[in-house]
Interface confidence: medium
């Protein structure tokens, strides 16, 4: 598995460097997860032709994946730090069940899938420390998540491949959009 952020050889070789700020640590964590997603997407694309599927075909899939919208306060127009932070944390919490689904979907990148899942948990902790209004963050219902997981795992092979591809793509886009927003904070 790849080395988690803050433990790469460059950091070890340069102990005199300034400690990372909270923002830099979050940035590094997100980029580490994005690197993991890239590796998982490679395996998915090599294994099936889902990556060539048109966006329209993918949009027909009825997965309720988190997505940023204007009202979430994360875009430059109408930016609202606290509303946006709540959206990012809530979205990441909602992605957790989908990341759990990914755990048995990879052969050669099994460790990578686990690393993405665990690193996301760490990222949520970093962001929760940054948030002032933790009460506004809604945690997904475990029973609902469990039944969703069962439903996803019961799909036929083609739909499972489609779901895997869609989760990875949506998670990547959500993280990239979060990065854009977090850099304004």
């Amino acid at each position: 598995a790849p080395v988690p952020p803050g433990e790469d050889s460059k950091d070890v070789a340069a102990p005199h460097r300034q400690p990372l700020t909270s923002s830099e640590r979050i940035d590094k964590q997100i980029r580490y997860i994005l690197d993991g997603i890239s590796a998982l997407r490679k395996e998915t694309c090599n294994k099936s032709n889902m990556c060539e599927s048109s966006k329209e075909a993918l949009a027909e899939n009825n997965l309720n994946l988190p997505k940023m919208a204007e009202k979430d306060g994360c875009f430059q127009s109408g930016f609202n730090e606290e509303t946006c932070l709540v959206k990012i944390i809530t979205g990441l919490l909602e992605f957790e069940v989908y990341l759990e689904y990914l755990q048995n979907r990879f052969e050669s990148s099994e460790e990578q899938a686990r690393a993405v899942q665990m690193s996301t948990k760490v990222l949520i902790q970093f962001l929760q420390k940054k948030a002032k209004n933790l009460d506004a963050i809604t945690t997904p219902d475990p029973t609902t998540n469990a039944s969703l997981l069962t439903k996803l795992q019961a799909q036929n092979q083609w739909l499972q491949d489609m779901t895997t591809h869609l989760i990875l793509r949506s998670f990547k886009e959500f993280l990239q959009s979060s990065l854009r927003a977090l850099r304004q904070m």
Partner: antibody
């Protein structure tokens, strides 16, 4: 062939409006970051705006905020820069470019540029 | 906006020289920095991205380093085709450029 073809430049009076177009071929703008960069005569490069494909989220430099609008037409695979309330200091070559879909992004593809001259 | 300050503005050097251009950001930008080369009448081309990653097809005499606020572009042994203007660009927030460094023949 992967390329960006620009059009829409020209001579315009101060206070006027102009729309620049940038047609992409060989890739889809619906899954790529796009960016506009300008260069005043004999000067350096200045980032103007960018558009992130996810939800069409746009960012603008302070110098153009409120006057310029970046948009896209996915069916035409084209991005636009609508420039209003133009000033003499907006004169220059405007480049349409693509951010590489990486983290961090960088510009991996440029248009040839189109000249905008704001003068009375 | 994040302000990028490049130095020097002009640099005179000879073929075979080792040259270094520096770029400083007004706030921490992690490794969200790229270096571009521009020749007169042409669009710029990327040399280095992610502060130190060499773009495919770019000669290995070009190298980049730095993180946070201070960055450098080094050309280990100048070639005739390297005389041009060089720009740094941050992509942490927006995409502001440094003012450029014109590398000219001594």
């Amino acid at each position: 062939e992967v390329q960006l073809v620009q059009s829409g430049g020209g001579l315009i009076q101060p206070g006027g409006s102009l729309r620049l177009s940038c047609a992409a071929s060989g890739f889809t703008i619906s899954s790529n970051y796009m960016i506009w960069v300008r260069q005043a005569p004999g000067k350096g490069l200045e980032w103007v705006s960018d558009l992130y494909y996810y939800a069409g989220d746009t960012y603008y430099a302070d110098s153009v905020k409120g006057r310029f609008t970046m948009s896209r037409d996915i069916s035409k695979n084209t991005v636009y820069l609508q420039m209003n309330s133009l000033r003499a200091e907006d004169t220059g070559v405007y480049y349409c470019a693509r951010w590489a879909d990486d983290h961090p992004p960088y510009i991996d593809l440029w248009g040839r540029g189109t000249l905008v001259t704001v003068s009375s | 906006d994040i302000v990028m300050t490049q130095s020097p503005s002009t640099l005179s050097a000879s073929v075979g020289d080792r040259v270094t251009i520096t770029c400083r950001a007004s706030q921490g930008i992690s490794s969200w920095l790229a270096w571009y080369q521009q020749k007169p009448g042409r669009a710029p081309k990327v040399l280095i991205y992610k502060a130190s990653t060499l773009e495919s097809g770019v000669p290995s005499r070009f190298s980049g380093s730095g993180s946070g606020t201070d960055f450098t572009l080094t050309i280990s042994s100048l070639q005739p085709e390297d005389f041009a203007t060089y720009y740094c660009q941050q992509s942490w927030l927006g995409g502001s450029f440094g003012q450029g460094t014109k590398l000219e023949i001594k």
